[in-house]
């Protein structure tokens, strides 16, 4: 079955049931959350505002999808496995009276067996585990996963200690000096350079050496963290940021609604599942995605990709490749090209690599 | 690629019956909620009926409950309406559609097939 | 059972025209809301899901807006090709469909 094919997840409450106060609801979805992401790698955010992977949604009776819920007792709720749209996300039924403890029907326990669902998992045969497929008050204070329902969901997502791979766990800083430092993507913003990271962003007002971390979501609270590739088109206000098969458009600073949107509505065959990199050059009025070791050439005023990509980034991009992180442009007349913690000052009417550099050599290090 | 294939279709009498398939390919079939989607000549869509990826679960429109029933053989990729006492207003195109994978259906129709027409009249 | 009202029924229009269509549902459906284009003797086309997502392979002047009750589809500037049928569905229940002709 489907699986979400990143560790930070976003859920969102969209309304909330009149039984309980707003902040136990809360409380009780957050702890639930806090069950699976305490043995997996998965991270949880709530969102208030956007498209959030997970929504949570309180509703009786006809709701908008298939399964319309029956009143009191019977189903309690219901929520739909990993993917785009309705996928993830846990509905339940208003005609339950929901609480905090053991009368009527506990939030917080409803909420684990339904976001196990929206994470993947199936229902267990073990009545022990809260993947089983019935109801039944446990303790919440002393409540455990079984070691089935762990066992699932570690065949799914792997334990938590797989965090540790990651070079930057999502709660610290990375050094901004360190000389194996790499980004996930860079683009200039007016006369700003952002550099993104994990769930940070340096920003770099040009030719002034101070630069300033800040968290993606403190700007933009409806993005999500590890954005791969972004673009700007100076002469629109607008910057472009990816994240998967996912992309997002910023006028003037501000997040625009209806995003995010497939990146295949830029012509990408379905292969494509994701942007490592992308650049606008204003005098051709294209823009250059790079994916693994090929790249595609966008036309912004015809909005449509042109012919006879993709090509080879090594084929046309003397000395860069195969694969890059991120790049942008600069000067009128650069792209600077990320590969790890490496960055190339790359001549674009010449064809060639003029400078190379370290990654983190725009902050004075 | 994905593909729907739907046959079965033809005239058939008042109070008559009609087996429609669909065969199915591209896509692991046993993963996918799948449904029938009608349409009468010149009018809109009109979906009948869905069924879940393990044929445990149906779901007919009340204009078809009783009538018809969707079923599917995971082992041939092929998704079954079995069409019975049909009606003048049944008189239709025949689509199947591909919904997401999952427990729960999405109603999300992201394949269709071609199509199979089904004229019922004396 | 809830019901989907979309509007207007038709709608005639020009190459490079910004278009609006609108549909309407009798209770919240969140998000839950898709959108085909169906071109005559051809099976329906998904084009946006989840109210807003582009499904893939669509070009980008198509783009769908709303939650709860109200929705629109908008196509930003009409192309020869876009003149068809279009739909707003939510589970089980369609729009009655508008058909965008050339003006």
């Known amino acids: 079955g489907p699986v979400w094919r990143k560790h930070y997840i976003t859920y969102r409450i969209n309304n909330y049931t009149p039984d309980m106060n707003r902040e136990d609801v809360d409380y009780a979805i957050r702890k639930a959350f806090q069950v699976w992401s305490n043995v997996t790698p998965l991270k949880f955010s709530k969102i208030n505002t956007g498209m959030a992977d997970i929504l949570v949604v309180f509703a009786r009776g006809a709701h908008g999808d298939f399964h319309a819920f029956d009143g009191k007792g019977g189903i309690l709720a219901h929520a739909f496995g990993p993917g785009s749209g309705i996928g993830g996300d846990a509905h339940f039924d208003e005609d339950e009276f929901w609480t905090t403890h053991s009368g009527g029907t506990n939030l917080f326990l409803t909420a684990v067996h339904e976001i196990g669902h929206s994470l993947g998992l199936g229902h267990s045969s073990d009545p022990k585990a809260v993947m089983f497929p019935t109801y039944k008050y446990v303790d919440i204070n002393t409540f455990r996963l079984s070691a089935d329902d762990i066992r699932g969901i570690q065949s799914l997502y792997g334990d938590p200690k797989e965090n540790q791979r990651l070079p930057n766990p999502d709660n610290s800083e990375p050094a901004l000096c360190d000389p194996n430092l790499s980004f996930d993507a860079v683009t200039t913003v007016g006369n700003k350079i952002f550099f993104f990271k994990d769930r940070f962003f340096w920003l770099k007002v040009s030719e002034r050496p101070k630069t300033s971390v800040n968290l993606i979501s403190s700007l933009w609270p409806t993005l999500p963290s590890g954005i791969e590739a972004a673009y700007e088109i100076e002469a629109r206000n607008q910057v472009f940021l990816f994240k998967d098969d996912k992309y997002w458009l910023i006028s003037n600073l501000r997040p625009e609604p209806n995003y995010p949107k497939s990146i295949h509505s830029f012509g990408f065959p379905n292969f494509v599942k994701k942007i490592d990199a992308a650049v606008f050059n204003p005098r051709f009025y294209r823009t250059y995605f790079f994916v693994d070791n090929q790249y595609w050439r966008y036309d912004e005023r015809r909005q449509m990709m042109d012919p006879g990509y993709p090509k080879l980034i090594t084929k046309n991009f003397q000395g860069i490749g195969p694969k890059i992180d991120a790049v942008f442009y600069s000067k009128n007349k650069y792209y600077y090209f990320f590969q790890g913690s490496n960055q190339f000052e790359y001549d674009f009417l010449l064809q060639r690599i003029t400078k190379t550099l370290k990654s983190n050599s725009w902050f004075g290090c | 690629e994905v593909q729907l294939l739907e046959s079965g279709g033809g005239l058939v009498q008042p109070g008559g019956s009609l087996r429609l398939s669909c065969a199915a390919s591209g896509f692991t079939f046993s993963d996918y909620w799948l449904h029938w989607v009608r349409q009468a000549p010149g009018k809109g869509l009109e979906w009948v009926s869905g069924?879940?990826?393990?044929?445990?679960?149906?779901m007919y429109a009340d204009s078809v409950k009783g009538r018809f029933t969707i079923s599917r053989d995971n082992s041939k990729n092929t998704l079954y309406l079995q069409m019975n006492s049909l009606r003048a207003e049944d008189t239709a195109v025949y689509y199947c559609?591909?919904?997401?994978?999952?427990?729960?259906?999405?109603?999300?129709?992201?394949?269709w097939g071609r199509g199979t027409l089904v004229t019922v009249s004396s | 059972d809830i019901q989907m009202t979309q509007s207007p029924s038709s709608l005639s229009a020009s190459v490079g025209d910004r278009v609006t269509i609108t549909c309407r549902a009798s209770?919240?459906?969140?998000?839950?809301l898709n959108w085909y284009q169906q071109k005559p003797g051809k099976a329906p086309k998904l084009l946006i899901y989840?109210?807003?997502s582009l499904q893939s392979g669509v070009p980008s002047r198509f783009s769908g807006s709303g939650s709860g009750t109200d929705f629109t589809l908008t196509i930003s500037s009409l192309q020869p090709e876009d003149f068809a049928t279009y739909y707003c569905q939510q589970a089980g229940i369609f729009g009655q469909g508008t058909k965008l002709e050339i003006k």
């Open positions: 989840a109210a807003s």
């Open positions: 069924i879940s990826p393990s044929g445990g679960m149906t």
């Open positions: 559609a591909r919904d997401i994978v999952g427990p729960y259906s999405a109603g999300l129709f992201d394949y």
């Open positions: 209770q919240s459906i969140y998000t839950y």
